[in-house]
Amino acid sequence: PSPPPEKKELRKVAHLTGKSNSRSMPLEWEDTYGIVLLSGVKYKKGGLVINETGLYFVYSKVYFRGQSCNNLPLSHKVYMRNSKYPQDLVMMEGKMMSYCTTGQMWARSSYLGAVFNLTSADHLYVNVSELSLVNFEESQTFFGLYKL
Amino acid sequence: PSPPPEKKELRKVAHLTGKSNSRSMPLEWEDTYGIVLLSGVKYKKGGLVINETGLYFVYSKVYFRGQSCNNLPLSHKVYMRNSKYPQDLVMMEGKMMSYCTTGQMWARSSYLGAVFNLTSADHLYVNVSELSLVNFEESQTFFGLYKL
Amino acid sequence: PSPPPEKKELRKVAHLTGKSNSRSMPLEWEDTYGIVLLSGVKYKKGGLVINETGLYFVYSKVYFRGQSCNNLPLSHKVYMRNSKYPQDLVMMEGKMMSYCTTGQMWARSSYLGAVFNLTSADHLYVNVSELSLVNFEESQTFFGLYKL
């Protein structure tokens, strides 16, 4: 007899977009409306919660902009938290200093993306240094991953 | 009897590189020569045409440069068009303002990459704000995707 | 009888992080400690060595910074070398010119990522123009790939 039909496993994937009511760190994300994806991964209080150990490609983009450039240092981090470890682990980080002309209207993006071995119950978050300078348009600021 | 050998499906993938005869938007791409890939996806008038619904990682990089900086706002968009929808959907976007010193020779890149749920017959394109400031070297300006 | 259990093939993947004892080009990488991954790919003298022909997503980020900006042109390249070809092939490249205010402390990242058809025995490397301006923190400067 032929083997039973293969059970097509749902791809573990997330693509979350900017949410302008973020008031503190970590950033919060839109997980329901628009071009959002969330399958086989949970979203909880700003974090993507891994429920299956394995290799994941993780990415994030943040769009910073301002009206009167003061060159405040900008940072953009993707970090991981797990109850088994006391401290957050910074997985990827981008920093910018001296990036615009004083007083000018300015805009700049930071993009991060790489492969990590993640464990069930890992929580992934995004942090920025200057929340007031982030623009949360869904096409400009986002956070995602997929299991390889 | 043993089951028939598995039919290895061709990976749906594209990597197109800059084409300097782009005269208008959307950008046009080299789809034949050099480090180009095009498999299971069609290329038509600047666009990648999806022929199988599913999850795709989509990416693009654009290299902007100029002889004498005047800080024209730069934008780099990946957008989607489908005959079922009246309006283009901007999937990812990068913007830059106040990024160089007035009068200086300058160079800067914009990188975008994320996961999207695409539908058969979706057309994906890249748009930039200042075509004359784009350098089309194959290693510097490109557009690609692959099905997860 | 039921077919033999499928042999789960190890995913070919690498994520290497910055190594501050790089003294010349190509950059050298940490391949053992920290958030490093190396599976089904070899690391040799700064290079990732492909041992199975196929499609790979290749990425790299480099974090440049300095104490006193003098706007030295920065370049960041991922290139490929194979004994069958006389010359290195630049796969991806980012360049920056006129990116900070003269005399100021500055920081900037370059990110590259795309899909390539790689052949067994291809060696992949990362090159930068100004080694002294690279910061090698593991979260900031990295090089990786995975087989699709």
């Epitope: 301002g66 009206q67 450039c69 003061n70 060159n71 001296s98 004083t102 000018q104 209207m105 300078l133 | - | -």
Partner: antibody, heavy 119, light 111 residues
């Protein structure tokens, strides 16, 4: 509460220089650029330039280039505007104003400093 | 640089009535969906006070009788029902690019 307090009135001779100070309090000083605007007697407002309180560099109105210098002392949360080679038409009230990078306009202003240039 | 032109130079209105002040820019002050136009009020011997930012947004603490409108090159400040404390000079200013420039001002006086 947010305050920008400027130094007192000055009388200068033509050809001299004047240095006006502007001290910020009640907010995180290095989060805001400081702009300088002047107003000649009975006239409108004229933008002179802006300084980064974080980085210390400035952008000036071309009209004043070479005559104006803006500096910052982060330790005292004070910005200085020095105008050299004074002429009678520089007689004006000089204002400092802060500008939040994330906003659209100068939201708080100093009380103004009258500089009189007269022989 | 962008030149701002206000009209009229002087406007005489009775208390309780509506006042409409106009400002024109020599080129568009819009970018990316926003209009970089601000309005300030100045009384004799005082520093300017921000009323409206980004063409139509009321600054915190400013009475709702003040409103702004317009986009591109043409902007309007409207005071719906003039109070005695509203008689002052009003300036428009763009913040689209450096150098910022102000209009020459409109003096609002009691009729």
């Amino acid at each position: 509460q947010v305050q920008l307090v400027q130094s007192g009135a000055e009388v200068k001779k033509p050809g001299a220089s004047v240095k006006v100070s502007c001290k910020g309090s009640g907010y995180t000083f290095t989060d805001y650029t400081i702009h300088w605007v002047r107003q000649a007697p009975g006239q409108g407002l004229e933008w002179m330039g802006v300084i980064s309180t974080y980085q210390g560099d400035a952008s000036y109105n071309q009209k004043f280039k070479g005559r104006v210098t803006m500096t910052v002392d982060k330790s005292t949360s004070t910005v200085y505007m020095e105008l050299s080679s004074l002429r009678s038409e520089d007689t004006a009230v000089y204002y400092c104003a802060r500008f939040p990078d994330w906003d659209y306009a100068m939201d708080y202003w100093g009380q103004g400093t009258l500089v009189t240039v007269s022989s | 640089e962008i030149v701002m032109t206000q009209s009229p130079a002087t406007l005489s209105v009775s208390p309780g009535e509506r006042a409409t002040l106009s400002c024109k820019a020599s080129q568009s002050v819009d970018y990316d969906g926003d209009s970089y136009m601000n309005w300030y009020q100045q009384k004799p011997g005082q520093a300017p006070r921000l009323l409206i930012y980004a063409a139509s947004n009321l600054e915190s603490g400013i009475p709702a009788r003040f409103s702004g409108s317009g986009s591109g090159t043409e902007f309007t400040l409207t005071i719906s029902s003039l109070q005695s404390e509203d008689f002052a000079v009003y300036y428009c200013q763009h913040s689209r690019e450096l150098p910022y420039t102000f209009g020459q001002g409109t003096k609002l006086e009691i009729k």
